[in-house]
Interface confidence: low
């Protein structure tokens, strides 16, 4: 006996009903919210004499559809409609003609949860294999975008940071990149899987926190790391030590204190009052131009406002409540089919503007 | 007791159309593949249709495609074999048979190889 | 069209062995699918004796037996009876028409 007929008696709920017509796919498959998973499914059908020369029609079906009345969620038949809340996301990638009903599902959805059957068609030959079912489970996205700062961040001295999500898939919807710091920032280049901020740290950035939010539209959801800056200011012999960090990509931090032009932890101490204090002044200044608030979750971009083309300064909205003297955050937007982007900040140099101001980048 | 009991034979002049029906009892019909198979006069066996238990699956013999069409109603526990543009050749006893289980043919398998009786269908002018 | 040939006849003795073989192709019988054998008796429509090459169908003596190697299927008898006067066809699925039946051979009981 040849091994294709073989393989079918070897796989465990590899047969349907009947003995030549036999599928075999995994029972259940996991995919996190957004994310894509490819299925492989293998299928045999007897061909008739006077069906071998017809194309070979493979469909992936809901459990409980009704072939004559309900549309597939996939299919090869070109002419074929298929559910409008699948389009475009299942594909059957598998080619039925060679005996390949492989499933691909990108951006995946709660709604996608259930069991799915193959159909095929040839000809006059037809059959839908009932066993087995391939069962869809959609989970919470638990993977997490990474941020990785190459060396050391050094006051004035920009350096590339890169967002990925290397866990992402090819074949989904480029996801939506956002970044939220305090420090005077530009946007890089960006893959489809990694955005670069370009960031030219202050002093007074070290601490603050930096996040990279990453949104996958075609499922709307959104994952995203926040990570402290460690800007060392080493005008000798400088030191650095590994931040312990999150476990989410390689960051080399500053080893101890700032160095420089503060002598004592005295002085720094009151520099520090009177930089919250002065902070605080510009702050309540600024709280009476500000006509809305967004918050550092919020990816969308706030109708109305400049493009980063025609703005010299990052726009100022109202202040979120906060512990520290880390200010307001106000929000850069961009174009919607902006990609790249170059932005102009103010307080480029430390020396001339000691407050805090938080920008957010966002890319799509 | 198994029974299938074909029905519907008969004369039919060449070009004309018939319907021949299956009644099965005695075993689950829906789980049963059932197909068609004749024998003309004095000869051999020969395979015409099948159709699965679901009813998806319709098969049939270069010698009958396009002009038979099998079908089967599960609730009423029938087979069918709806014949048009019939020739002298296709005259024949035409039995129905059937399989235990979903198989491509009427004998995989279990064993079960349950045939009627036979109809005879005579096609002359 | 596949072709599943058979002696058109056979003789043998009571008590006798005899062997009536079926001969396909890869496409049938030599590609590894289900085989089975029936009897037909005069008069009657044909019955079941071998499925699956050779399992004997339920009320079939244990006289018949079934064997294959390759596209050559064999269909035993051992210790002839004068009932066994019938013809026998071979039947497997086959690629280009879904299911064959040989020719059919007549064994003549003498």
């Known amino acids: 006996m040849p091994l294709l007929l073989l393989l079918p008696l070897l796989w465990a709920g590899a047969l349907a009903m009947d003995p030549n017509f036999w599928l075999q796919v995994q029972e259940s498959v996991t995919v996190q919210e957004g994310l894509c998973v490819l299925v492989p499914c293998t299928f045999f059908h007897p061909i008739p004499y006077y069906d071998k020369n017809s194309p070979v029609h493979g469909y992936w079906f809901r459990e409980g559809a009704i072939i004559s009345r309900d549309s597939p969620v996939a299919t090869n038949k070109l002419d074929q409609e298929v559910q409008e809340e699948t389009q475009g996301r299942f594909r059957l990638l598998g080619d039925p003609s060679r005996n390949n009903c492989s499933l691909s599902i990108v951006d995946a959805r709660r709604r996608d949860n259930g069991s799915y059957f193959f159909r095929m068609e040839r000809g006059s030959t037809k059959y839908s294999y009932k066993s087995p079912q391939l069962s869809v489970h959609v989970t919470d996205l638990t993977h997490r975008p990474k941020i990785l700062i190459p060396g050391t961040l050094e006051p004035g001295h920009s350096k590339n940071l890169t967002c990925s999500v290397s866990w992402a898939c090819e074949q989904g919807t480029p996801p939506i990149f956002s970044w939220l710091s305090a420090a005077p920032t530009s946007l890089g280049p960006r893959t489809t899987h990694s955005s670069v901020l370009i960031i030219t740290p202050r002093p007074q950035d070290h601490g603050t926190n930096l996040t990279c939010q990453v949104k996958f539209a075609g499922a709307g959801v959104t994952t995203e790391r926040t990570i402290q800056l460690n800007v060392t200011y080493v005008p000798q012999n400088p030191t650095t030590g590994i931040f312990p960090g999150d476990g989410s990509g390689k960051q080399e931090t500053r080893a101890g204190v700032v160095h420089g032009a503060i002598g004592g932890a005295g002085v720094t101490a009151l520099l520090a009052l009177c930089l919250c204090l002065i902070f605080f002044i510009v702050k309540t200044h600024r709280r009476k131009a500000a006509r809305t608030a967004v918050g550092r979750n919020d990816t969308h971009p706030t109708t109305g406002s400049a493009s980063p083309k025609h703005q010299k300064k990052s726009k100022l909205h109202g202040p979120t409540e906060t512990s520290s003297c880390s200010g307001a955050a106000p929000t850069v937007e961009m174009d919607e089919e902006l990609h790249y982007a170059s932005l102009n900040f103010h307080g480029m140099n430390p020396s001339k503007d000691t407050s805090t101001e938080y920008s957010e980048v966002r890319t799509q | 007791q198994v029974q299938l009991v074909e029905s519907g034979g008969g004369l039919v002049q060449p070009g004309g159309s018939l319907r021949v029906s299956c009644a099965a009892s005695?075993?689950?019909?829906?789980?049963?593949?059932m197909g068609w198979v004749r024998q003309a006069p004095g000869k051999g066996l020969e395979w015409i249709s099948g159709?699965?238990?679901?009813?998806?699956?319709?098969t049939y013999a270069d010698s009958v495609k396009d002009r038979f069409t099998i079908s089967r109603d599960n609730a009423k526990n029938t087979l069918y074999l709806q014949m048009n543009s019939l020739k002298p050749d296709d005259t024949a006893l035409y039995y129905c048979?059937?399989?235990?289980?979903?198989?491509?043919?009427?004998?995989?398998?279990?064993?079960?190889?349950?045939w009627g009786e036979g109809t005879l269908i005579t096609v002359s002018s | 069209q596949a072709v599943v040939t058979q002696l058109s006849s056979m003789s043998g003795s009571p008590g006798q062995t005899v062997t009536i073989t079926c001969t396909g192709s890869?496409?049938?019988?030599?590609?590894?699918?289900?085989l089975s054998w029936y009897q037909q008796l005069p008069g009657t429509a044909p019955k079941l004796l071998i499925y699956?090459?050779?399992n004997r169908a339920s009320g079939v003596p244990n006289r018949f037996s079934g064997s294959k190697t390759g596209s050559l299927a064999s269909l035993t008898i051992t210790g002839l009876q004068a009932e066994d006067e019938a013809d026998y066809y071979c039947?497997?699925?086959?690629?280009?028409?879904?299911?064959?039946f040989g020719g059919g051979t007549h064994l003549t009981v003498l």
């Open positions: 039947g497997s699925y086959d690629e280009s028409l879904s299911y064959v």
């Open positions: 159709i699965n238990s679901g009813g998806e699956v319709t």
């Open positions: 048979a059937g399989g235990e289980g979903s198989s491509w043919y009427p004998d995989y398998y279990y064993g079960n190889g349950y």
């Open positions: 699956n090459v050779n």
């Open positions: 890869s496409s049938n019988i030599g590609g590894g699918y289900y």
């Open positions: 005695g075993f689950t019909f829906k789980n049963y593949y």
